[in-house]
């Protein structure tokens, strides 16, 4: 055992920065720090076989399997995967350890399996075994958290039935509005399932696992706040738990709170009250209305009344299935090159949506903001004034929604020209779509003013590059113009742009494309 080399096996996970990852040493990847794989001599094996802990990675992940060998002298090596030999080039690190790496780019099923590394050193021969499999993420789920009352205690339990088991945290804030944004100093996070301090202004519970993060806000009516102009609305699906908190502050304890559904007092067992004195000796009362599993008949106006405050209501709507309500008609926008502009979609949805903005096959993160009227809005401003088609896609457990936007950027045409033996073509991407003219340059018309109308064929939009329209014009070659310079011009309301082409002559002149503008 003392004569054997010290072997360290590591896994390096790469975050792909680019879809065109190659196997060269300069592939555009950001690497996480190496992770030890606990390489150990395999018990009762013939020969010296080291084994690394089994590795499970996501499909399309890019990883490096690496072995560091602390043994004197040179080493030679060979990788074997599914009976195929793979090249192996050891190098030495700063600590003079031999380093052997196997890069697996964009992991697929065919790349899963056993990777054997055979190493020959001056002292001994040994084998290192890596087993790489693809993680089955099909079983993964992340469900929105919901609340339950803790048995025999005035506390709420936050539950998220997710796989892998999520980390649950309460996100608490005692300020109003904007200052309750996630990373604000007013926000306090508690990584626990049970919450006893239920008097705060804003209470949310979030669950996170490998799939992301989902949050649920404790719906609250604050009798000390001016009511919203539109009645607050709460949607729930049949079978989900209902929780509404009514909160009121008064100079002394001489007030009470009650809940009514459609003017009928809630049954006992469907509410509980808590009270506390605040720092300035005012009394805070909260009264929870809850139904452990809602049915259609739990729909209606829930009103919280106080003997010392004006009452306030919320409309609870119980639905069989989730929904996304928004207008899906496509929208076209035309803006100047430096004009500030954002796409926006206003929608009403339950459960909360997951969404993306897509442009030219690239997805962008999607942020949503709740409005006071029960609607939400998602804006996208990061278009960098690139014309084309933008797609907003939203989905929740029960519904999907897609909306298309076209962005046109007003600009003067820019012309590209190409010619063949039989025709000359010009292309332009200006907007509004340009009109075309062709002119012949000759002794009679050195300024190229002689217009060509014969043999011209205009196509308004002959190809779409990620939704961007390109206009083209083609001039068919005739004997009358062979050997001459011709000029194609594209013009729109913002200006004109031209390109000059020397048409292929039958004489000794070779074909040239001349870009004189």
């Amino acid at each position: 055992n003392q004569d054997l080399p010290v072997i360290k096996c590591v896994l390096i996970n790469h975050k792909n920065n680019d879809s065109s990852v190659g196997k060269s040493s300069s592939y555009p990847m950001v690497s996480e720090s190496p992770e030890d794989l606990g390489c150990a001599l395999r018990p009762q094996s013939s020969g010296t076989v080291y084994e690394a802990a089994a590795v499970e990675v996501d499909v399309s992940a890019s990883i490096t399997l690496q072995v560091l060998v602390d043994a004197p002298g040179n080493i030679s090596c060979l990788w074997v995967f599914k009976h195929s030999s793979l090249n192996c080039q050891p190098h030495f690190d700063l600590q003079n350890r031999g380093v052997v790496s196997m890069v697996i780019l964009k992991m697929t099923e065919t790349q899963a399996g056993e990777y054997l590394l055979f190493i020959q050193s001056e002292a001994t021969n040994y084998t290192i075994l890596f087993t790489v499999s693809i993680r089955n993420t099909l079983l993964y789920t992340l469900r929105r958290p919901y609340f339950r009352k803790m048995e025999n205690q005035d506390a709420l339990v936050c539950i998220s039935e997710s796989v892998p088991e999520p980390i649950v945290e309460w996100v608490l804030c005692d300020s109003q509005g904007e200052s309750c944004k996630e990373e604000s100093p007013a926000v306090v996070k508690k990584e626990e399932k049970v919450l006893h301090e239920l008097f705060g202004t804003d209470i949310r519970c979030c669950a996170r696992n490998e799939l992301g993060r989902e949050c649920t806000r404790l719906f609250t009516i604050d009798l000390n706040q001016t009511p919203q102009t539109t009645l607050p609305q709460l949607f729930l699906k049949v079978g989900e738990p209902l929780w509404i908190r009514c909160k009121a502050v008064h100079v002394n304890h001489g007030f009470g709170l009650t809940w009514e559904l459609e003017n009928k007092a809630l049954e006992e067992g469907n509410y509980f009250e808590m009270s506390t004195y605040s720092t300035n000796r005012t009394m805070i009362r909260i009264l929870f209305a809850f139904v452990s599993s809602v049915a259609r008949n739990d729909t209606g106006y829930y009103t919280c009344s106080s003997s010392k405050h004006p009452s306030q209501s919320a409309l609870v709507t119980i639905v069989e299935k989730g929904f996304i309500n928004a207008t899906n008609s496509s929208e076209d926008y035309e803006i100047d090159q430096y004009e500030e502009f954002c796409f926006s979609v206003r929608f009403k949805a339950y459960p909360q949506i997951r969404c993306t903005w897509t442009f030219s096959r690239k997805s962008f993160p999607c942020e949503q903001k709740g409005l006071d009227n029960g609607y939400s809005i998602s804006k996208f401003c990061n278009h960098k004034h690139q014309p084309g088609e933008y797609i907003f896609h939203a989905e929740n457990d029960d519904a999907q929604f897609t909306k298309m936007f076209t962005l046109n950027i007003r600009r003067k045409p820019q012309v590209l020209a190409e010619a063949s033996a039989s025709q000359a073509s010009c292309f332009s991407d200006g907007y509004p779509l340009p009109s075309w003219t062709w002119k012949k340059c000759s002794d009679k018309s050195p300024n190229c003013t002689e217009e060509i109308t014969e043999g011209v064929w205009n196509r308004k939009a002959n190809r779409k590059v990620f939704g961007q329209w390109v206009s083209s014009s083609t001039l068919n070659m005739s004997e009358a113009i062979k050997g001459f310079l011709v000029k194609c011009c594209a013009y729109n309301s913002l200006g004109t742009s031209c390109e000059t082409i020397l048409l292929n002559s039958p004489g000794p002149f070779p074909f040239i494309q001349d870009n004189i503008s």
Epitope: E35, D36, V55, V57
Partner: antibody, heavy 124, light 107 residues
């Protein structure tokens, strides 16, 4: 270099809940099939295994303490958390966390690397 | 649960002695057994895994043998740094269980 470090309160009162955190570096529970266990050792006594969490989030607990123990992990923070409810003076011990790699050919080398341990005293 | 009975619970020996510590499992655990050495105020250190595989960096005077229910740890020639407490651990099935320990003292 692989390290594990236990942290938490050094003193807890009877009936309180103990929360211990094992923060590790040099390996992860994200890609490699690894597990982390909690083990304790009362002063002058033998080692006692408490709980284990696997990289796929499966858990296993000591039979005698199962009702009081909860183990969880936060892969992104490289942490494993143990909670032990309703603490009693007999729970006074040094608490260790240790890692256990799993090998695809069906064997395990048990705990190859341990944390230094954290002493917890239960007293009113 | 699988019970691990370790013997002796304490042992006095001299430098150069050959020492054997035994662990008995209450049921078949194949070779899923590890041996650990612990010194006062320190964390345990793995010596042997899979009943007989020597941990990298551990002196070859330590050896392990056995399979099924009977296991032994042998130190062929005791060195001053070997005086410590030794534990066996079965990891064949959960819950995992340690032996009661063997305290090896200088005679």
């Amino acid at each position: 270099q692989v390290t594990l470090k236990e942290s938490g309160p050094t003193l807890v009162k009877p009936t309180e809940t103990l929360t211990l955190t094992c923060t590790f570096s040099g390996f992860s529970l994200r890609y490699a099939r690894m597990g982390v266990s909690w083990i304790r050792q009362p002063p002058g006594k033998a080692l006692e295994w408490l709980a284990h969490i696997f990289s796929n989030d499966e858990k296993s607990y000591s039979t005698s303490l199962k009702s009081r123990l909860t183990i969880s992990k936060d892969t992104s923070k490289s942490q494993v958390v143990l909670t032990l409810t309703n603490m009693d003076p007999v729970d006074t011990a040094t608490y260790f966390c240790a890692r256990m790699p799993e090998y695809s050919s069906g064997w395990s080398g048990a705990f190859d690397i341990w944390g230094q341990g954290t002493m917890v005293t239960v007293s009113s | 649960d699988i019970q691990m009975t370790q013997s002796p619970s304490s042992l006095s020996a001299s430098v150069g002695d050959r020492v054997t510590i035994t662990c008995r499992a209450s049921q078949d655990i194949r070779n899923d057994l590890a041996w650990y050495q612990q010194k006062p105020g320190k964390a345990p250190k793995r010596l042997i895994y899979a009943a007989s595989s020597l941990q990298s960096g551990v002196p070859s005077r330590f050896s392990g043998s056995g399979s099924g229910t009977e296991f032994t740890l042998t130190i062929s020639s005791l060195q001053p740094e070997d005086f410590a407490t030794y534990y066996c651990l079965q990891h064949n099935s959960y819950p995992l269980t340690f032996g009661g320990g063997t305290k090896l003292e200088i005679k």
